[in-house]
Interface confidence: medium
C-alpha cells in the first residue's frame, strides 16, 4: 500500500493544533430524518440546509422541514425557517438554485390536498424570501433558463407546461399534456406533447415542439417522437420508424429546423439509447443490445452527430434508466472510464485516453497484488467501482472523483484482478489522468478534493461504528495524516465541500443518537493554516499530459495536440488559492490516420488504423440524407475526429456534393424538410442526459 504515517512521509508540522483551531462544530436541534445541502452561488460561502421529517398517515404524508443558512462555508448556521413561514419544503425537489452566481433560490412547498402549490423565492442568496402561490402543483423541480435566471419552466402534476418570465412572480400556461420539457440554448424551450391526453401510453406518438419566444409562438419540429434529448449543440429525437416498434435517432444542429440521419442501429421497444456524454464537438451514444442482455455498444459521433464509429462493445448498462459506470475523467482531456460485461459475465473496467478511439484495461497499480479473480497472479488490471457496484449493494460509498482544476488527479474505489471483485474495495489514486494508479487507502472511504488538488481529504466508511477521524494528504495521496476532529464519534453520513474543489473547507456531517435524543451535527474544518503560504512559481513543475514515450516526437499528442501543464509539486505544501487558474501550453501535432474517424460507408478492421470500405457498399454511390437534402459523398474513407486540432502530416481528401434533391421520410412531420434518423429513450422518458444539480442528500 501507499506510505501511511511513517518516516518516509513528509509530515505537516503542528497540524493537530492548526486544525483544532479551525474546526467548527454546529449542532442542529432537530429530529428530522433526512438532510440536504445546496450551495448558493460560487465562492459566496452560502449554504442552505434543508432538514425534513415525513410521516405517512393513511393516504397523505404529514411532514415538517427546517431551513438553515450559512454564509461562512458551513462553520456557522442560522435557522431561517421563519423566513418561509415554517412551511414544509419538499425534500425531493424542494431547493432549486439559480444558474451561475445569480443568487436566486426557489423553494417548492408541499401543500397537501391543494389544487395549487406555493413557492418561496429569493434573489439575494437566501437572505430574504417572497412567498408566491402557484396555480398548479409541480411534478418536478422548477427549471431555470441557463441564459436568464428570471425565466422559469415548470411541469405540473397534470402534465401542463408553465412558464414565468419574472422569476416566478407570474405564471402562464404554455401547453397541455406535455410529457417532457427542456430548456435549450437562447431561452428556447423544447417539449413533447400528446394530443391523446396521456404520457404513459402512446410513447412513440408524441409531437416535438419548440418555442423560441417563451410561448408567443410554437413550431412542431417532429412527430412520431418517442423521446428527445439535448447534448452539447445537438438535439436528438428518437422516432418511430414505421417498421413495427422500431425507433431510430434523428439529430439536428439547428434547433430542429432540419434533421439528419444518425448512422446508428434502430432499436425495439425493449431497448434504449442513452447519451453518455456530449459536448459541442461530439457525442458518446450507448445503443442497447436486444433482449435483457444488460449491455450494449458505445458509438462516438462525428462533428455533426450523424456518422458514428463503434467505440466499445459489450458496454455495461443494465436496463432503461439503469446503471452504467461510464465516467468522464474531467481532470484530463479525452479520458473516460467505464465497465464492460465480459463473455464470462464478469464485469471489467476499461479506459480510453483518446475520447473513445481505443479502450484498454487499467494498468495494475505497482503497489498492489492481483486478487483471487486473477488467473495469472502476476498479470491483472485495476477495476473501478462506480454506479453499478453501488447499485448491487457493494460497500462503495462514492463514485470516482476528478476535478478539471485538479489536473491529472482521479480518485476511485477499486479492486485488482481479472474483473471487479465483490470483496471490500480499496481507494486508488491516479495523478496522471488514469495512466498509472497507486493504492492510497485501505478499505472504503468518502473522499473529496480541496484547493484544486492541494489537499485530498478522506473519511473511512464505517457503518457499524462512529467516526471521529479525518485523513488528509497534501501530496496527491502518497502520504496521509490523521486528525481526530471530535472526542465523541458521530454516526457519519457524508462529506460536503463546495463544488469546484477550490475551497479549503470540508464539512463532516452525521448525527448523534441516544435512547431519548437524536440530532444532526456538522464539523467544518478549514485547512487554511495547513497550507500557510501562497504557492509561488518554484512550487510548480512542468508536466506533459498523456506522455507515454518521451522519446517520441509526437509524445503526448491526443486529438491532434499536446498540452504541458504547470502542476503543483508533491513536496510543496502551499495554497493554490481560490483564484487558481490551470496553466497550460498547447502545441499542435502533425496529423496521422489516428486523427481521423472512418467516414460513412467505411470501417476500421481490428488493430488497423486504415479505414476500408464496407463490403456491402463497395462500388455503390454513397448517398445519404443531410439537413433534408440528398448528398453524394466522395471520400477516401476518413473524416477528422471532432475536436482534433492536428495540422499537416497525413491529409485524406473528402468532398460532399449536394445532389439538389430533397429527401424526406415519414419519421418526422411531412410538412417539413425531414430525414431518416435514429432515436432514444432513457430513464424518465428522455435520453439519459447526465446533468445533475449540485445537491447533497443524506438519510439515516
Amino acid at each position: 500500500s501507499a506510505p501511511g504515517e511513517d518516516e518516509e512521509c513528509g509530515r505537516v508540522r503542528d497540524f493537530v493544533a492548526k486544525l483544532a483551531n479551525n474546526t467548527h462544530q454546529h449542532i442542529f436541534n432537530d429530529l428530522s430524518g433526512s438532510v440536504s445541502l445546496s450551495w448558493v452561488g460560487d465562492s459566496t460561502g452560502v449554504i442552505l440546509v434543508l432538514t425534513t421529517f415525513q410521516v405517512p398517515i393513511f393516504m397523505i404524508t404529514i411532514g415538517q422541514s427546517k431551513l438553515y443558512r450559512s454564509e461562512d462555508y458551513g462553520k456557522n448556521f442560522k435557522d431561517i425557517t421563519d423566513l418561509i413561514n415554517n412551511t414544509f419544503i419538499r425534500s425531493d425537489f424542494g431547493i432549486a438554485i439559480g444558474p451561475e452566481n445569480s443568487g436566486k433560490v426557489v423553494l417548492t412547498a408541499d401543500v397537501s390536498g391543494s389544487h395549487g402549490s406555493r413557492i418561496f423565492r429569493s434573489s439575494d442568496f437566501a437572505k430574504n424570501f417572497v412567498q408566491q402561490e402557484l396555480p398548479f402543483v409541480p411534478l418536478m423541480q422548477i427549471m431555470y433558463s441557463p441564459q436568464n435566471s428570471d425565466y422559469l419552466l415548470a411541469l405540473s402534476n397534470k402534465n401542463e407546461l408553465w412558464v414565468s418570465k419574472n422569476f416566478g412572480g407570474k405564471w402562464e400556461k404554455l401547453y397541455d399534456t406535455v410529457c417532457l420539457a427542456k430548456w435549450g440554448s437562447d431561452n428556447t424551450i423544447f417539449f413533447t406533447a400528446n394530443h391523446n391526453g396521456s404520457c404513459s401510453n402512446d410513447r412513440g406518438m408524441l409531437e416535438l415542439w419548440r418555442t423560441s419566444d417563451l410561448g408567443k409562438s410554437f413550431k412542431t419540429i417532429g412527430s412520431k417522437i418517442y423521446s428527445f434529448g439535448l447534448g452539447g449543440r445537438f438535439l436528438f429525437a428518437s422516432v418511430m420508424t414505421g417498421k413495427g416498434t422500431l425507433r431510430a435517432i434523428h439529430v439536428s444542429t439547428d434547433q430542429g429546423d432540419t434533421w439528419s440521419m444518425a448512422q446508428l442501429p434502430p432499436v425495439g421497444h425493449e431497448q434504449f439509447y442513452s447519451i453518455l456524454a456530449a459536448n459541442d464537438d461530439m457525442v458518446f451514444m450507448h445503443v442497447d443490445e436486444p433482449g435483457d442482455s444488460g449491455f450494449g455498444t458505445i458509438f462516438t459521433s462525428d462533428d455533426r452527430g450523424i456518422v458514428y464509429s463503434k467505440s466499445l462493445e459489450r458496454h455495461l448498462y443494465t436496463t432503461t434508466g439503469g446503471e452504467t459506470d461510464f465516467t468522464n475523467v474531467t481532470s484530463l482531456r479525452g479520458v473516460y472510464i467505464t465497465s464492460i460485461l465480459a463473455e464470462d459475465k464478469s464485469v471489467q473496467s476499461m479506459i480510453t485516453f483518446d475520447q473513445g478511439g481505443r479502450w484498454t484495461h487499467l494498468r495494475k497499480p505497482e503497489n498492489s497484488k492481483c486478487d483471487a479473480t486473477a488467473r495469472d497472479p502476476e498479470k491483472c488490471s485495476l477495476h473501478i467501482h462506480a454506479a453499478y457496484s453501488i447499485a448491487t449493494g457493494l460497500n462503495v460509498p462514492m463514485l470516482p472523483l476528478s476535478e478539471p482544476n485538479a489536473v491529472g488527479i482521479v480518485i476511485a474505489h477499486g479492486s485488482v484482478g481479472d474483473a471487479i471483485s465483490v470483496m471490500r474495495p480499496d481507494v486508488y489514486i491516479s495523478d496522471d489522468g488514469g495512466y498509472s494508479w497507486t493504492k492510497a487507502l485501505e478499505g472504503p472511504h468518502h473522499y473529496t478534493i480541496l484547493d484544486s488538488g492541494g489537499i485530498i481529504v478522506a473519511v473511512e466508511q464505517n457503518a457499524h461504528q462512529g467516526v471521529n477521524q479525518i485523513k488528509f494528504s497534501t501530496d496527491e495521496g502518497q502520504c496521509w495524516q490523521t486528525y481526530n476532529f471530535t472526542k465523541d464519534p458521530i454516526f457519519f453520513t457524508g462529506l460536503a465541500s463546495e463544488p469546484g474543489a477550490r475551497s479549503m473547507n470540508i464539512s463532516i456531517w452525521g448525527y448523534r443518537s441516544s435512547l431519548f435524543h437524536q440530532y444532526w451535527i456538522s464539523y467544518t474544518i478549514d485547512f487554511k493554516d495547513i497550507l500557510e503560504r501562497n504557492c509561488e512559481e518554484k512550487d510548480y513543475t512542468i508536466w506533459l499530459a498523456h506522455s507515454t514515450d518521451p522519446e517520441d516526437y509526437e509524445d503526448g499528442c491526443i486529438l491532434g495536440y499536446k498540452e504541458q501543464f504547470l502542476r503543483l509539486r508533491k513536496s510543496s505544501v502551499c495554497q493554490n488559492g481560490r483564484d487558481y487558474v490551470v496553466t497550460k501550453q498547447p502545441s499542435i501535432c502533425l496529423c496521422s490516420l489516428e486523427d481521423f474517424l472512418c467516414d460513412f460507408g467505411y470501417y476500421r478492421p481490428e488493430n488497423d488504423s486504415k479505414c476500408v470500405e464496407q463490403p456491402e457498399l463497395k462500388g455503390h454511390d454513397l448517398e445519404f440524407c443531410l439537413y433534408g437534402r440528398e448528398e453524394h459523398l466522395t471520400t477516401n474513407g476518413y473524416r477528422k475526429i471532432p475536436g482534433d486540432k492536428c495540422q499537416g502530416g497525413v491529409n485524406p481528401v473528402r468532398e460532399v456534393k449536394d445532389l439538389k434533391k430533397k429527401c424526406t421520410s415519414n419519421f418526422l412531420s411531412p410538412e417539413k424538410q425531414n430525414s431518416k434518423s435514429n432515436g432514444s429513450a432513457g430513464g424518465s422518458g428522455g435520453l439519459n442526459d447526465i446533468f445533475e444539480a449540485q445537491k447533497i442528500e443524506w438519510h439515516e
Epitope: I542, L544, S547, P550, E551, D552, Y553, D555, G556, Y561, K562, Q564, Q585, S587, I588, C589, L590, C591, C646, Q647, G648, G649, N651
Partner: antibody, heavy 121, light 109 residues
Framework: EVQLLESGGGLVQPGGSLRLSCAAS????????MNWVRQAPGKGLEWVSA????????YYADSVKGRFTISRDNSKNTLYLQMSSLRAEDTAVYYC??????????????WGQGTTVTVSS | EIVLTQSPGTLSLSPGERATLSCRAS???????LAWYQQKPGQAPRLLIY???SRATGIPDRFSGSGSGTDFTLTISRLEPEDFAVYYC??????????FGQGTKLEIK
C-alpha cells in the same frame, strides 16, 4: 552557459570515413534530442540526422541513410556522427544542434560553431 | 516530402524599414513545428522564432512570426543594421524529419 562544440572534421577521400564529435555543456544533455545539420559551400541548410534523448530512436535524411550513423554517450555528454562511404556532395560545414526537450519541439535552439568536412581526391 | 519555398530570394531594404519574408509549404504544416533562423556570414544559424509565432530567448520584439497551414511570414518591424543576413524557415515533419527553405537574403539597399 549552454554550449556545443564540434570536432573531427577534415579532408577525406571519396569512399572514406570520418567520425564527428559534439561536446555538450551547460544543460541536461540526456533530456534533449540532438541533430546534425550541414551546409554545403554557398548553399542552404540541410538536416542530416537526429537522435532522441536516450539514444533509443535515430532518424536520417534519405541522402545519408545507410552511410551515416548517429549515436550519443550521455555519460560523456557527447554526440557522434560516424560517416562512411563519403561522397563529394557530402562536403559541407556540419553543425551539431540541440533539438527538442521532452514534450515539445521548440526549434533548434542551440547550435555549435560547425566543423568542416571536405571530400575530395 | 514537404517542400518549403521562401520568397523573395533577395530582399533589398534600408535600416528603419519593415521587412516581410514569406515561407510557403507544399502541403499543410503544423504551426507548432515551424521555425525561423537567422544566419550571418561565417556564423552558425540562430533560432529566432519557433511554433510559428513564439520568439526564442533573447530575440528582440521587432521580430515576429505569423501564419498557419501553408503560408507563414517573418516580419521585422524596423530594420537594424545587424538584421541584414540570410533567413531560413524550417519545418518538423515526418519524413524527412526536418526540411529548410532555400533561404531569403536580406541585404542593405
Amino acid at each position: 552557459e549552454v554550449q556545443l562544440l564540434e570536432s573531427g572534421g577534415g579532408l577525406v577521400q571519396p569512399g572514406g570515413s570520418l567520425r564527428l564529435s559534439c561536446a555538450a555543456s551547460g544543460f541536461t544533455f540526456s533530456s534533449y534530442a540532438m541533430n546534425w545539420v550541414r551546409q554545403a559551400p554557398g548553399k542552404g541548410l540541410e538536416w542530416v540526422s537526429a537522435i532522441s534523448g536516450s539514444g533509443g530512436s535515430t532518424y536520417y535524411a534519405d541522402s545519408v541513410k545507410g552511410r551515416f550513423t548517429i549515436s550519443r554517450d550521455n555519460s560523456k555528454n557527447t554526440l557522434y556522427l560516424q560517416m562512411s562511404s563519403l561522397r563529394a556532395e557530402d562536403t559541407a560545414v556540419y553543425y551539431c544542434t540541440r533539438g527538442r526537450g521532452i514534450g515539445y519541439y521548440n526549434g533548434m535552439d542551440v547550435w555549435g560553431q560547425g566543423t568542416t568536412v571536405t571530400v575530395s581526391s | 516530402e514537404i517542400v518549403l519555398t521562401q520568397s523573395p530570394g533577395t530582399l533589398s531594404l534600408s535600416p528603419g524599414e519593415r521587412a516581410t519574408l514569406s515561407c510557403r509549404a507544399s502541403q499543410s504544416v503544423s504551426s507548432s513545428y515551424l521555425a525561423w533562423y537567422q544566419q550571418k556570414p561565417g556564423q552558425a544559424p540562430r533560432l529566432l522564432i519557433y511554433g510559428a509565432s513564439s520568439r526564442a530567448t533573447g530575440i528582440p520584439d521587432r521580430f515576429s512570426g505569423s501564419g498557419s497551414g501553408t503560408d507563414f511570414t517573418l516580419t521585422i518591424s524596423r530594420l537594424e543594421p545587424e538584421d541584414f543576413a540570410v533567413y531560413y524557415c524550417q519545418q518538423y515533419g515526418s519524413s524527412p524529419m526536418y526540411t529548410f527553405g532555400q533561404g531569403t537574403k536580406l541585404e542593405i539597399k
